[in-house]
C-alpha cells in the first residue's frame, strides 16, 4: 500500500531561545511567531518540487 | 533552549532521508542570520507508514 507521500520526523534544538509556558499555548504571539518563522524557513530549505509541507509542530524545553 | 519536533511531507521518491537532513544542516547558517535561530542537534528519521496514514487523516 502506497500513499504517494513520504513522511519524515525531524527534531532540532534552538539554542538561543528560552522555552517558556507560552510555547505550550498555540494562541500566544511567541508560539505563532516561532511557528511562522519555522514554516517559512522550511519552505526556503526545501524549495524543490517534492516538498508538500509540514505538520505536527511541537515545542518542548531543551 | 527550545526543542522543535515536526513532521515533513514530500512526494514519494523525490527525496531520501539523507538529503532531508543534509539540506537542513546546510541551511543552519542562513537560519541564524535570516531568522535569528541558532540550530543544533538535528535528527531526522522516516515515519513508519501507519503513523503517516493517521497523520494524513487529519
Amino acid at each position: 500500500l502506497s500513499t504517494g507521500v513520504s513522511f519524515f520526523f525531524l527534531s532540532f534544538h534552538i539554542s538561543n531561545l528560552q522555552f517558556n509556558s507560552s510555547l505550550e499555548d498555540p494562541s500566544t504571539d511567541y508560539y505563532q511567531e516561532l511557528q511562522r518563522d519555522i514554516s517559512e524557513m522550511f519552505l526556503q530549505i526545501y524549495k524543490q518540487g517534492g516538498f508538500l509541507g509540514l505538520s505536527n509542530i511541537k515545542f518542548r524545553p531543551g | 533552549s527550545v526543542v522543535v519536533q515536526l513532521t515533513l511531507a514530500f512526494r514519494e521518491g523525490t527525496i531520501n532521508v539523507h538529503d532531508v537532513e543534509t539540506q537542513f544542516n546546510q541551511y543552519k547558517t542562513e537560519a541564524a542570520s535570516r531568522y535569528n535561530l541558532t540550530i543544533s542537534d538535528v535528527s531526522v528519521s522516516d515515519v513508519p507508514f501507519p503513523f503517516s496514514a493517521q497523520s494524513g487523516a487529519g
Epitope: 524543490q48 | 514519494e12 527525496i15 531520501n16 532521508v17 546546510q26 522516516d46
Partner: antibody, heavy 120, light 107 residues
Framework: QVQLVQSGAEVKKPGASVKVSCKAS????????MHWIKQAPGQGLEWMGY????????HYNQKFKDKATLTADKSASTAYMELYSLRSEDTAVYYC?????????????WGQGTLVTVSS | DIQMTQSPSSLSASVGDRVTITCRAS??????LVWYQQKPGKSPKLLVY???TLTDGVPSRFSGSGSGTQYSLTISSLQPEDVATYYC?????????FGSGTKLEIK
Amino acid sequence: QVQLVQSGAEVKKPGASVKVSCKASGYTFTTYTMHWIKQAPGQGLEWMGYINPGSDYTHYNQKFKDKATLTADKSASTAYMELYSLRSEDTAVYYCARQGNYAAYYFDYWGQGTLVTVSS
Amino acid sequence: DIQMTQSPSSLSASVGDRVTITCRASGNIHNFLVWYQQKPGKSPKLLVYNAKTLTDGVPSRFSGSGSGTQYSLTISSLQPEDVATYYCQNFWNVPFTFGSGTKLEIK
C-alpha cells in the same frame, strides 16, 4: 555527451599517498554530485563518499573518513580523491560516478576506473 | 548502517531462461533501490532505479520489483550478452551500501 575520464593506473609503496582525478565533460559540473566507489580485486563495490562541487560539501562513509579526502576544482571541472597512508588492502580500482540531478537517486555515469596498486 | 543481502551469489542458467536475483535490505529503504550490471573489466552500468524504473536503452527483458526491504531484478529471457555481475544499491541513507553481487553465467 557526458564523460567522466579518470587518471591512469598508479603503483605506490605502503605509507605513500595517491591522488586520483576525474575530469567531467558534457554537463554543468557544479550541479551534479560526484561519488567515489572502491572495488578491490575480485570483490564487490564499496561506496566511499561524495562531494557536491557546487558547494564543496562532502560526506564520507565512516570507514573511509581517515583514508580519503574528496575535493573538486570547479574551473577544471575535475573531482579528486586523495588516499593516504596506503596499505596493501587499499589496492583496488577506484571509480568516480555522477549522481543524477534533482530527485535522481542513482549513478548514471561512471568513470572508467583507476587501478591503484600498493606494493613494496 | 543498512546492510544489503543479495542472493544468490552466483547463478548459471540457459539462454531463454527466466532469471531472478533478490536483494534484502536490513531496513525499509522506501524503493530507493538501484540495480547495476558490471561486465568483466568494465565500469558498472545503471539498469534500474527507484526499484522498478528501467533506465533508457536497457532492454525490456529486464525488470525490477519490490518494496520495503525486499527487492528483485528479473531477466525474462536470458541472452548471452547478459553475462555479468549484478549489484543492488541502497540509496535511502548513507552509507549508500551495495549488495555483494550476483555473478550470472550461461550454462
